[in-house]
Interface confidence: low
């Protein structure tokens, strides 16, 4: 007669157990467990019992335990439940904001979870069950709709799984999705009123005010106020269920012509808009083009300044010739260059009145690297014991790294007070070194010993 | 006088955060896009960030999408780049600056450095 043991086990996926077969005969020819499972068998003594260890559990088993004794074949089962929670528990997506008066369908999707007899699915509405189903199908789905009314906004809608496994002596599993929080509005179907100037001069302030009633919930309205692609930046007022966006709009040169003056109210997903067009005249800032901004030295460099197609233009204090929008300037990059800036200014008149604009780009000029005798002396002459500070700079851009060395091993502390010894006389080679390329020099260093009277 | 004047800078270990600012002055703050740029040692420009004039578009380099966030504070004229979960590779020194052009304040995108007005920068460290 074959036993085993235990005869019922519920273990979470991925689990290891224990089982024990054993046989009632004292000398069985045969004592096994038949499982497609990763098995161990422990070192137990005596031939009437066997104990194994299946592990990686991953979905429900029915191990066997084999004996062949003298009486005859036997075989006893052992019923390996799996458990474990969904893999995905999920809300369909929904926009956020939903009209009041609109029937909402929400929809959970499960999937996985085992044992599914004690799998369920709740919908809820803040703590208040909704429904409540078993879980059915891959995925199981379950669905329920809502009437939106105003007071659920801001309810936060979930679904919840329950795994309950406490009539197996183990636990109530709960897994619930993320939170969908609702949002109700209603937007009146009359579009806002916009009060605004007609005409706007560049450099100048106008007064926009837009406003409109019947909102809910007010607070939440979004108001784009825009001149053309420029978004404006209102102060807006609140009441029960209304508003008035008030915003001073300061109009700039690429705003010139006929503008299209727009108040967007947004709420929820829907909007009312409101259009009015502006006139507006301008002038905007001469543009100055380097070929390029950063250029070694020796390079030519063109800087060009371009404005308002009536506009007359100086560069560097120089006329356009012939006296237009637009002048240009050639020059070959030298280090003096580095820094220097390009001045474009414009002038324009408009109705009889000149208008000045003025834009600035800086040159950066690589060159280098440099070393000479003012700032790095080719020969020292110092008393031994005397404190000196050894100095040589290099020039360039970027700024070169630099070593002496003695014998090519042997540094000169550069920038670093020093002790003056008889290690120190020597010729040293300073190497300059940059991206732009390197340069050498050589320093002597002279010791003067003390005499002794 | 066009001034940007930035702050916030200094020593912080991989995973910390670190919030920059920009405090700009001299021009019409609402009417321009802003951006921040870094200058890693030894290495060229890199565009970090920009937002649009009513700070309601904002763009990032990839190298830093999701864990750095720019926004603005028109009535301070100020520009914030908040940095998080920092990396030794975000070690640079950070510049704001402004396009001055009219043209460019309501352009759909950012354009590429270099550009008018520069701060001085920031040195933002990133060691642990």
């Known amino acids: 007669q074959t036993s085993v043991s235990p005869s019922k086990v519920i273990l979470p996926r991925g689990g290891s157990v224990l089982v024990t077969c054993s046989t009632s005969c004292d000398q069985p020819k045969l004592l096994g467990i038949e499982t497609p499972l990763p098995k161990k068998e422990l070192l137990l003594p005596g031939n009437n019992r066997k104990v194994y260890e299946l592990s990686n559990v991953q979905e429900d088993s029915q191990p066997m335990c084999y004996s062949n004794c003298p009486d005859g074949q036997s075989t006893a089962k052992t019923f390996l439940t799996v458990y474990w929670t969904p893999e995905r528990v999920e809300l369909a997506p929904l926009p956020s904001w939903q009209p009041v008066g609109k029937n909402l369908t929400l929809r959970c999707q499960v999937e996985g979870g085992a044992p599914r007899a004690n799998l369920t699915v709740v919908l809820l509405r803040g703590e208040k069950e909704l429904k409540r189903e078993p879980a059915v199908g891959e995925p199981a789905e379950v669905t329920t709709t809502v009437l939106v009314r105003r007071d659920h906004h801001g309810a936060n809608f979930s679904c919840r799984t329950e795994l309950d496994l406490r009539p197996q002596g183990l636990e109530l599993f709960e897994n619930t999705s993320a939170p969908y929080q609702l949002q109700t509005f209603v937007l009146p179907a009359t579009p806002p009123q916009l009060v605004s100037p007609r005409v706007l001069e560049v450099d100048t302030q106008g007064t926009v005010v837009c406003s409109l009633d019947g909102l809910f919930p007010v607070s939440e309205a979004q108001v784009h106020l825009a001149l053309g692609d420029q978004r404006l930046n209102p102060t807006v007022t609140y009441g029960n269920d209304s508003f008035s966006a008030k915003a001073s709009v300061s109009v700039t040169a690429e705003d010139e012509g006929t503008q299209r003056l727009t108040c967007a109210v947004i709420l929820g997903n829907q909007s009312q808009e409101t259009l009015q067009t502006v006139t507006i005249y301008s002038f905007p800032a001469p543009n100055v083009i380097l070929t390029k901004p950063e250029v070694s030295e020796g390079t030519e460099v063109t800087v060009k300044c371009e404005a308002h197609p009536r506009a007359k233009v100086t560069l560097n204090g120089v006329p356009a010739q012939p006296l237009g929008p637009r002048a240009q300037l050639l020059l070959k990059a030298t280090p003096e260059d580095n820094g220097r800036s390009f001045s474009c200014s414009a002038t324009l008149e408009v109705a009889g009145q000149l208008i000045h604009k003025n834009q600035t780009r800086e040159l950066r000029v690589l060159y280098g690297p440099r070393l000479d005798e003012r700032d790095c002396p080719g020969n020292w002459t110092w008393p031994e014991n005397s404190q000196q500070t050894p100095m040589c700079q290099a020039w360039g851009n970027p700024l070169p790294e630099l070593k002496c060395l003695k014998d090519g091993t042997f540094p000169l502390p550069i920038g670093e007070s020093v002790t003056v010894t008889r290690d120190l006389e020597g010729t040293y080679l300073c190497r300059a070194r940059s991206t732009q390329g390197e340069v050498t020099r050589k320093v002597t260093v002279n010791v003067l010993s003390p005499r002794y009277e | 006088q066009v001034q940007l004047q930035e702050s916030g800078g200094g020593l912080v270990q991989p995973g910390g955060s670190l919030r920059l600012s920009c405090a700009a002055s001299?021009?019409?703050?609402?009417?321009?896009?802003m951006y921040w740029v870094r200058q890693a040692p030894g290495k060229g420009l890199e565009w970090v960030s920009g937002?649009?004039?009513?700070?309601?578009?904002?763009y990032y380099a990839d190298s830093v999408k999701g864990r750095f966030t720019i926004s603005r504070d028109g009535s301070k004229k100020m520009v914030y780049l908040q940095m998080d979960s920092l990396k030794p590779e975000d070690t640079a020194v950070y510049f704001c600056?402004?396009?001055?052009?009219?043209?460019?304040?309501?352009?759909?995108?950012?354009?590429?450095?270099?550009?008018?007005?520069w701060g001085q920068g920031t040195l933002v460290t990133v060691s642990s």
């Open positions: 600056y402004v396009q001055a052009a009219a043209w460019w304040s309501l352009v759909g995108g950012p354009p590429p450095p270099p550009s008018d007005y």
């Open positions: 001299g021009f019409t703050f609402s009417n321009y896009w």
């Open positions: 937002i649009d004039h009513g700070g309601d578009s904002t």
